[in-house]
């Protein structure tokens, strides 16, 4: 029997059965290549948590959510890579408060990249969970057009190109 | 599923390439890791790999150098391991993440015997 | 890198009875822990992702809990099929992604 390091439970009377199921459920889907679709499982999962959430080393709380700023610069579809690598998201802005927060912990002023881009599929700006923005809350500066993408500087929202390299941040 | 290949019996400071395959679907856009456990001994995690564009890969720090994980086709990823002792005799096992929210590792492969 | 400390290193209980398991993480990891089972000459099964989420056709008598670096879990009602070894692995979602395992702890089902 396999000891050692493990935990290793026996059944001193009686027979234990050895069989093992496996059930293949809740695979990754990539929409296009990008956007996943979150199973009801983790998604229930990771609300009733919110209360109580408690953030990796080197990530900020705030309001149930955990934000990682980064250090180095990427493209946004790479900085979106990224956040994905790491089961969270490009940020998401739902209002002036977490703007706001988002402002105070950024420690330069150059921009950085968000999960909003423009898609032509659409043609409109979208957040990266797939919902419009909110044009009553958030104006952004620039082009609306193909190969456009969302970063923030001094609370505002600009349109650059998608190519450029800024730093991110990603929430989860 | 997922199953691994490659095992064998190998002299010491040799090297040894090992394959999981999978059946049933494709390395799209997946995290797969390599696991490996030596006889009576617990798990222990040597890297991952995103098989996406990224193509990302990830080791514990013991075996960045020694081990590198590769994409090769839609539907193999390799590990191959160099520099080989007696401390690598294990089973190695190829896991892939399911997850979205979190890291779920459900499917496994039987795992491949190395013996050094 | 971030270690992840499994224990007791032995614990007992009887058919019908609890099994409690410990995992502690040397920094904050979040919820980002799962737990497997493992019986002999078989391949880790998945019984519990993001600390406390049950994985499918795992029996609610397997219970997880915890964040942040302090993590349990929990066999009720224990049955001679959960005769296994379990472990638990954390997660890192820093520059460089780690996924340790716990050492683990010897259960014996009298």
């Known amino acids: 029997l396999l000891v050692s390091q493990g935990v290793l439970l026996k059944c001193q009377k009686g027979s234990c059965s050895n069989a093992t199921q496996y059930e293949d459920t809740g695979d990754l889907k990539v929409n296009n290549g990008t956007r996943r679709n979150i199973s009801n499982k983790d998604l229930c999962a990771s609300r009733s948590a919110d209360q109580t959430v408690l953030c990796q080393s080197e990530w900020l709380k705030y309001q149930g959510k955990c934000y990682w700023f980064s250090n180095e610069m990427k493209s946004w579809s790479d900085s979106y890579v990224y956040c994905l690598e790491r089961k969270s998201h490009l940020l998401i802005i739902h209002d002036q408060l977490e703007m706001a927060f988002i402002q105070k912990n950024l420690r330069q002023l150059n921009y950085v990249w968000i999960g909003l881009n423009f898609t032509s599929l659409k043609m409109t700006w979208t957040w990266v969970d797939g919902s419009p923005i909110d044009s009553k809350i958030f104006f952004i500066k620039g082009p609306a057009k193909e190969n456009s993408c969302a970063a923030i500087k001094e609370s505002k929202i600009f349109s650059e190109t998608c190519s450029s390299v800024f730093k991110w941040i990603c929430q989860y | 599923s997922l199953e691994e290949s490659g095992g064998d019996l190998v002299q010491p400071e040799g090297s040894l390439t090992l394959t999981c395959t999978a059946s049933?679907?494709?390395?799209?856009?997946?995290?797969m890791c390599w696991v490996r456990q030596a006889p009576g001994k617990g798990l222990e995690w040597i890297g991952c790999?995103?098989?996406?564009?990224?193509?990302?890969t990830y080791y514990a720090s013991w075996a960045k150098g020694r081990f590198t994980i590769t994409k090769t086709s839609s539907t193999t990823v390799t590990l191959q391991m160099t520099s080989l002792t007696a401390a690598d005799t294990a089973t190695y096992f190829c896991?892939?993440?399911?997850?979205?929210?979190?890291?779920?590792?459900?499917?496994w492969g039987p795992g491949t015997l190395v013996t050094v | 890198d971030v270690v992840m400390t499994q224990t007791p290193a032995s614990v007992e209980a009887a058919v019908g009875g609890t099994v409690t398991i410990k995992c502690q993480a040397s920094?904050?990891?979040?919820?980002?822990l799962s737990w497997y089972q493992q019986k002999p000459g078989q391949p880790p099964k998945l019984l519990i992702y993001?600390?406390?989420t049950l994985e499918s056709g795992v029996p609610s008598r397997f219970k997880g809990s915890g964040s942040g670096t302090e993590f349990t879990l929990t066999i009720s009602d224990l049955e001679c099929a959960d005769a296994a070894t379990y472990y638990c692995?954390?997660?890192?979602?820093?520059?460089?992604?780690?996924?340790?395992f716990g050492g683990g702890t010897e259960v014996v089902v009298k």
């Open positions: 692995q954390g997660t890192t979602r820093s520059s460089s992604i780690y996924w340790p």
């Open positions: 790999i995103y098989t996406g564009s990224s193509g990302s």
């Open positions: 049933g679907f494709f390395f799209s856009s997946y995290c």
């Open positions: 993001g600390a406390s």
């Open positions: 920094q904050s990891i979040g919820s980002d």
């Open positions: 896991t892939r993440d399911a997850g979205t929210t979190y890291w779920r590792y459900n499917i």
